[in-house]
């Protein structure tokens, strides 16, 4: 791994579990620079593997609301606008970090958690199982 | 919003900035259950809008390594295996939370940061700009 020289101005940690437990400032710094949010926000409808977005809410998690993609069809939309079952619509998933309140219901104590979320769908050639 | 009853066993926060600064346990709980990792890991190659994965490393960020998708083509792969420019390969982007060391180089002090990452690509019908 990469060794980071320690900044002498770092806060001290009196926590016995240091460095397992760290301080996190929840004032989010937003580094997003989506150059055209309007255009990219309609991909879910214009895709050959379109998807719907479902709201998943969990007050014990931060962020409490996550939007999940569910593919609309099992197949993909062809040039005629029909579902073609020779291709498969599949979810593109990403592992993300969230904060889970631990102990439960605590406003200022969390544990990092990895979850797998579906971000959108893509059209793939199927694995061949059935040979004529 | 949802009001969460406070657990009496919560750790106290002596921090003046509470609740802006919280304690986070970095022992990650992995809730991932990819039910078909063997089959789903090759979508980037089997998609009609295939992508390459590029490694982005930043020691001041947690996680320090993030993989970013870049679409291989401007168009989409058709049934003949050729690139069809009547369709567009576009990146599916997601806003994710990461931890940024703050002050820099500190091992136990972070700030939440939102970044936009490209997770994969999907094939979309283009927006018509040119009418014959």
């Amino acid at each position: 791994g990469i060794t980071i020289p320690r900044n002498p101005g770092c806060p001290n940690s009196e926590d016995k579990n240091f460095p397992r437990t760290v301080m996190v400032n929840l004032n989010i710094h937003n580094r997003n620079t989506n150059t055209n949010p309007k255009r990219s926000s309609d991909y879910y409808n214009r895709s050959t593997s379109p998807w719907n977005l479902h709201r998943n809410e969990d007050p014990e998690r931060y962020p409490s609301v996550i939007w999940e993609a569910k593919c609309r069809h099992l197949g993909c939309i062809n040039a005629d606008g029909n579902v073609d079952y020779h291709m498969n619509s599949v979810p593109i998933q990403q592992e993300i970090l969230v904060l889970r309140r631990e102990p439960p219901h605590c406003p200022n104590s969390f544990r990092l958690e990895k979850i797998l979320v579906s971000v959108g769908c893509t059209c793939v050639t199927p694995i061949v199982h059935h040979v004529a | 919003g949802i009001t969460i009853p406070r657990n009496p066993g919560c750790p106290n926060s002596e921090d003046k900035n509470f609740p802006r600064t919280v304690m986070v346990n970095l022992n990650i709980h992995n809730r991932n259950t990819n039910t078909n990792p063997k089959r789903s890991s090759d979508y980037y190659n089997r998609s009609t809008s295939p992508w390459n994965l590029h490694r982005n490393e930043d020691p001041e960020r947690y996680p320090s390594v993030i993989w970013e998708a870049k679409c291989r083509h401007l168009g989409c792969i058709n049934a003949d295996g050729n690139v069809d420019y009547h369709m567009n390969s576009v990146p599916i982007q997601q806003e994710i939370l990461v931890l940024r060391r703050e002050p820099p180089h500190c091992p136990n002090s972070f700030r939440l940061e939102k970044i936009l990452v490209s997770v994969g690509c999907t094939c979309v019908t283009p927006i018509v700009h040119h009418v014959a």
Epitope: H86, N88, P91, Q93 | T35, K38, S40
Partner: nanobody, 125 residues
Framework: QVQLVESGGGLVQPGGSLRLSCAAS????????IGWFRQAPGKEREGVSC????????YYADSVKGRFTISRDNAKNTVYLQMNSLKPEDTAVYYC??????????????????WGQGTQVTVSS
């Protein structure tokens, strides 16, 4: 050759039961999630159930929960779908396929392979 073969369909009265089988040849099901999908006349193909190999997690469509049970026998390289309390709306061609369960609540399934002939299930009095 790599193949998944569905069998066990037939004509059954409402309230009756059937057990569908999906047998794999040419590859082992040990590390694959396998599921059942169906297509009713004039309707889109839809996911019915899927069973993971890794952690045994399962997916069931809301319309079949409590009535259908998916199971696997890796020794026989076969996946089964036990269908009880059948209704006329269960009439469809049933297909098996490798699948992926997804969603934070394991509430969706996607097919990953090509489709076979399927097996016809007709529920009628």
């Amino acid at each position: 050759q790599v193949q998944l073969v569905e069998s066990g369909g037939g004509l059954v009265q409402p309230g009756g039961s059937l057990r569908l089988s999906c047998a794999a040849s040419g590859f082992t099901l040990d590390d694959d999630a396998i599921g059942w999908f169906r297509q009713a006349p004039g309707k889109e193909r839809e996911g019915v159930s899927c069973i993971s190999s890794s952690d045994g997690s399962t997916y069931y469509a809301d319309s079949v929960k409590g009535r259908f049970t998916i199971s696997r026998d890796n020794a026989k390289n076969t996946v089964y779908l036990q269908m009880n309390s059948l209704k006329p709306e269960d009439t469809a061609v049933y297909y098996c396929n490798t699948c992926q369960i997804y969603g934070l609540g394991h509430d969706a399934a996607a097919p990953l392979g090509s489709w076979g002939q399927g097996t016809q299930v007709t529920v009628s009095s």
